[in-house]
C-alpha cells in the first residue's frame, strides 16, 4: 500500500500557501484528485510529488494515490482544505444526473472544516427543500440526497454560516431521471377493422411511458403516416396519441397498420388489419358436419360460426321438423363473441328424445340479407326385435322384425334346450341374413327390417333365436316351440326403453 507524506488524513492550509504531497510505493504510483489549477506533478520511480506554491479554494478535495501494479489495488488518501474566508465552497460539478432511487451526490466541498456545524442545503433563490427530502452531509464529499425522486430535479445551493451570515455556493443542477423499465407501452384500437367502401373509420395509436423522451408513429403497409400527435400526462405517465380519421374509406386504405413506439430502451410495435369491402357480408359456417348422428338419450351442441359486417340485426334457431312443432328453448341457445366481426352461436340439445330428431336451422340477418345454415340430426337406436311363427306359401316360417338405427344386421341361431338366450355351448346352427328385407326407412326414423327363417319341422326341445345388432347395441328374441303350439320369449330386460 502506498504511503502519503504528510501522513495525516486531513491538511488545512490558507490560500496562497505552498502544499507538497508526496506518495511513495513499492512500484510506480499515480495521483488522482479533483481537477484544479496550479498543481505540479513530479514523478521519480516509486515516488510521485504533487505540489503547488499558490493554493486556492479550488484545490480543496481528496487526493488519492494508487499503485497500478499492486494486485491488491491498495490506495492512500489525504483530504486538503484550503480555507478561504470568502469562498466556503468548492463545487466540483454544476450538473449531477442520477436515476430515481439512487443517491445523488451534490459535490460542494467545504473549504474549512470548522464551518461544518452551520451547513445546509437549499434550492436556488433561498427556497426550502421539498418535503420528504432526505439528505446527509460530508465535508469531504458534499451533500447526498438519498433515494432521489424525479420531482427533486431542481437547482440547489450549498449554504454555510460565516460570521452570522449565510454564504451560498454556485448552483448545482440535479437531474433525476425516471428509471425506464422498457420501451413505451402501446395500444392500437381497434384490434381489427372492417368497413364498407365510403364509410368512415378511426384508428387510434397511443403510447405511454414514465419518461417524456419517446417517439411514436403509425404506419400503413410500411408507410409512416403524417398524423399530428396529441400529448398528455396522467397517472404519472406521459401519453402520446395519434388518431387516424378516415372520412370515406377506399380500397387503398385497407391493409396492415402498425403502431410503433421507441425510446432509449428499445422499440415496441403492435399491428392490426383493416379490411375494406364492397358491400355488407354475412357468412355462416360450422366446423361440425351438417349431418349429425347421435345416440338417443345423449346430448349434442350445434355450433355455428358467423362472420358479419355490419353487425347482426337478428338471429335465431328454428326446428324444421318432421316430428313436432316444438321450437328450441331460448335458454339452450347461447352466443359468444370471438371478436368484433366473428361470433359463435351454440344450441345445446341435452338428453335427446326421439321427437327431437330432424332439421335444425340457424338463421341470421344483417344489412347484407338473411343467411341460414341447417343441420340434419338423426338419432341412433339399438335394435328392438320380435319373432312370430307363421305359414308362408304353406311352409312354416319364423318371421323376425328388427328396428333401430343404423339399419340392424340379423342373425338366426338354433340351440338345444329351452333358453331365453342361446349361449355358445348350446348353439347347433347359425344363419346370417345378409339382406334382410327393409320394411320402412324414412329420414330421421328407425329402419325396420324383416328376416324370414323357413323351418320344415320345429324341433320341440330346441330354441330359435333372432339376434339383431348395429353400432349402438343389440337385441334378441327367443322362440321356443311347444307341443301345444309355439312360445315366444323376449329377452329378460329390454336394452332400450324409449
Amino acid at each position: 500500500i502506498p504511503v502519503i507524506e504528510p501522513s495525516v488524513p486531513e491538511l488545512v492550509v490558507k490560500p496562497g500557501a505552498t502544499v507538497t504531497l508526496r506518495c511513495v510505493g513499492n512500484g510506480s504510483v499515480e495521483w488522482d484528485g479533483p481537477p484544479s489549477p496550479h498543481w505540479t506533478l513530479y514523478s521519480d520511480g516509486s515516488s510521485s510529488i504533487l505540489s503547488t506554491n499558490n493554493a486556492t479554494f479550488q484545490n480543496t478535495g481528496t487526493y488519492r494515490c494508487t499503485e497500478p501494479g499492486d494486485p491488491l489495488g491498495g490506495s492512500a488518501a489525504i483530504h486538503l482544505y484550503v480555507k478561504d474566508p470568502a469562498r466556503p465552497w468548492n463545487v466540483l460539478a454544476q450538473e449531477v444526473v442520477v436515476f430515481e432511487d439512487q443517491d445523488a451526490l451534490l459535490p460542494c466541498l467545504l473549504t474549512d472544516p470548522v464551518l461544518e456545524a452551520g451547513v445546509s442545503l437549499v434550492r436556488v433563490r433561498g427556497r426550502p427543500l421539498m418535503r420528504h427530502t432526505n439528505y446527509s452531509f460530508s465535508p469531504w464529499h458534499g451533500f447526498t440526497i438519498h433515494r432521489a425522486k424525479f420531482i427533486q430535479s431542481q437547482d440547489y445551493q450549498c449554504s454555510a454560516l460565516m460570521g452570522g451570515r449565510k454564504v451560498m455556493s454556485i448552483s448545482i443542477r440535479l437531474k433525476v431521471q425516471k428509471v425506464i423499465p422498457g420501451p413505451p407501452a402501446l395500444t392500437l384500437v381497434p384490434a381489427e377493422l372492417v368497413r364498407i367502401r365510403g364509410e368512415a373509420a378511426q384508428i387510434v395509436c397511443s403510447a405511454s411511458s414514465v419518461d417524456v423522451n419517446f417517439d411514436v408513429f403509425l404506419q400503413h403497409n410500411n408507410t409512416k403516416l403524417a398524423i399530428p400527435q396529441q400529448s398528455d400526462f396522467h397517472n404519472n405517465r406521459y401519453q402520446k396519441v395519434l388518431t387516424l380519421n378516415l372520412d370515406q374509406v377506399d380500397f387503398q386504405h385497407a391493409g396492415n397498420y402498425s403502431c410503433v413506439a421507441s425510446n432509449v430502451q428499445g422499440k415496441h410495435s403492435t399491428s392490426m388489419f383493416f379490411r375494406v369491402v364492397e358491400s355488407a357480408y354475412l357468412n355462416l359456417s360450422s366446423e361440425q358436419n351438417l349431418i349429425q348422428e347421435v345416440t338417443v338419450g345423449e346430448g349434442l351442441n350445434l355450433k355455428v360460426m358467423v362472420e358479419a359486417y355490419p353487425g347482426l340485426q337478428g338471429f335465431n334457431w328454428t326446428y324444421l321438423g318432421p316430428f313436432s312443432d316444438h321450437q328450441p328453448e331460448p335458454k339452450l341457445a347461447n352466443a359468444t363473441t370471438k371478436d368484433t366481426y366473428r361470433h359463435t352461436f351454440t344450441l345445446s340439445l341435452p338428453r335427446l328424445k326421439p321427437s327431437e330428431a330432424g332439421r335444425y336451422s340457424f338463421l341470421a340477418r344483417n344489412p347484407g340479407g338473411w343467411r341460414a345454415l341447417t343441420f340434419e340430426l338423426t338419432l341412433r337406436y339399438p335394435p328392438e326385435v320380435s319373432v312370430i311363427w307363421t305359414f308362408i306359401n304353406g311352409s312354416g316360417t319364423l318371421l323376425c322384425a328388427a328396428s333401430g338405427y343404423p339399419q340392424p344386421n340379423v342373425t338366426w341361431l338354433q340351440c338345444s334346450g329351452h333358453t331365453d338366450r342361446c349361449d355358445e355351448a348350446q348353439v347347433l346352427q347359425v344363419w346370417d341374413d345378409p339382406y334382410p328385407e327393409v320394411l320402412s326407412q324414412e329420414p330421421f326414423h328407425k329402419v325396420t327390417v324383416q328376416s324370414l327363417l323357413t323351418v320344415e319341422t320345429l324341433e320341440h326341445n330346441q330354441t330359435y333365436e333372432c339376434r339383431a345388432h348395429n353400432s349402438v347395441g343389440s337385441g334378441s328374441w327367443a322362440f321356443i316351440p311347444i307341443s301345444a303350439g309355439a312360445h315366444t320369449h323376449p329377452p329378460d330386460e329390454f336394452l332400450f326403453t324409449p
Partner: antibody, heavy 118, light 110 residues
C-alpha cells in the same frame, strides 16, 4: 364539406409584418397538420413550414427561420402565419393547405395575396 | 432553385398523350411517395395524383402517375384543352421534415 378559408389581401410596407389566417371547417382541425406554401408572381410553389394544431409544435423551412411564426387557435379551428421584416420579394400569394396522412396536400385555401411595396 | 427538377414546359395537341418528368434524390422521391398538383390559371393548386399513382375522386383516369427510384412521371392521355395548366410534382423530404416541390411545368394544349 372540407374547406379552408383564408383572410383577405394585404398591402404592407417593407420591414412590417403580416398575419394571415386560415379557418378550417368540415373536419377535425386538430387531426391534420397545416402547411403554409407561397407562390411569388410567375413563380413556383415554395413550402414555408407546418404546424401541429394539436400541440402547437412547428417546423419551418430554413429560409424562413426567425421571420415566420405559425400559431393556431383550436377553439375557432383557425391557423395563422405571421411573416415579419417584410421585403419586396415577399410579395406573393400565401396558401394554407391541409396535409393528408399520406403526405399530400389534399385541401388548399383560396390564397391570400400579400403585396410588399414602399 | 427547386429541389425537384421538372421541365419548364410541355405541349401537345388534343387527344395526344404527354408525359412530364420529375427527378429528385434519395431523401425525397427515393424514400417517399410522389404527389402531383394541377394549378389552373388564377386558382389554388389542386391535388391530382397522390402516393405515386392514386387518383383522388373526381380526377379523370386520363391522368396517371408512376415512380421509379428517384424519378417520377405524370402521364396525361387524350389531352383536352381544359388540361392547360401548371403541373407541380412534390415529395416529402426526410432531411427537411417537410415537402419539396418541383419548379412546375407549364402545359400548353396546341
Amino acid at each position: 364539406q372540407v374547406q379552408l378559408v383564408q383572410s383577405g389581401a394585404e398591402v404592407k410596407k417593407p420591414g412590417a409584418s403580416v398575419k394571415v389566417s386560415c379557418k378550417a371547417s368540415g373536419y377535425t382541425f386538430t387531426g391534420y397538420y397545416m402547411h403554409w406554401v407561397r407562390q411569388a408572381p410567375g413563380q413556383g410553389l415554395e413550402w414555408m413550414g407546418w404546424i401541429n394544431p394539436n400541440s402547437g409544435g412547428t417546423n419551418y423551412a430554413q429560409k424562413f427561420q426567425g421571420r415566420v411564426t405559425m400559431t393556431r387557435d383550436t377553439s375557432i379551428s383557425t391557423a395563422y402565419m405571421e411573416l415579419s421584416r417584410l421585403r419586396s420579394d415577399d410579395t406573393a400569394v400565401y396558401y394554407c393547405a391541409r396535409l393528408y396522412y399520406y403526405y399530400n396536400m389534399d385541401v388548399w385555401g383560396q390564397g391570400t395575396t400579400v403585396t410588399v411595396s414602399s | 432553385q427547386s429541389v425537384l427538377t421538372q421541365p419548364p414546359s410541355a405541349s401537345g395537341t388534343p387527344g395526344q398523350r404527354v408525359t412530364i418528368s420529375c427527378s429528385g434524390s434519395s431523401s425525397n422521391i427515393g424514400s417517399n411517395t410522389v404527389n402531383w398538383y394541377q394549378q389552373l390559371p388564377g386558382t389554388a393548386p389542386k391535388l391530382l395524383i397522390y402516393s405515386n399513382n392514386q387518383r383522388p375522386s373526381g380526377v379523370p383516369d386520363r391522368f396517371s402517375g408512376s415512380k421509379s427510384g428517384t424519378s417520377a412521371s405524370l402521364a396525361i392521355s387524350g389531352l383536352q384543352s381544359e388540361d392547360e395548366a401548371d403541373y407541380y410534382c412534390a415529395a416529402w423530404d426526410d432531411s427537411l421534415n417537410g415537402p419539396v416541390f418541383g419548379g412546375g411545368t407549364k402545359l400548353t394544349v396546341l
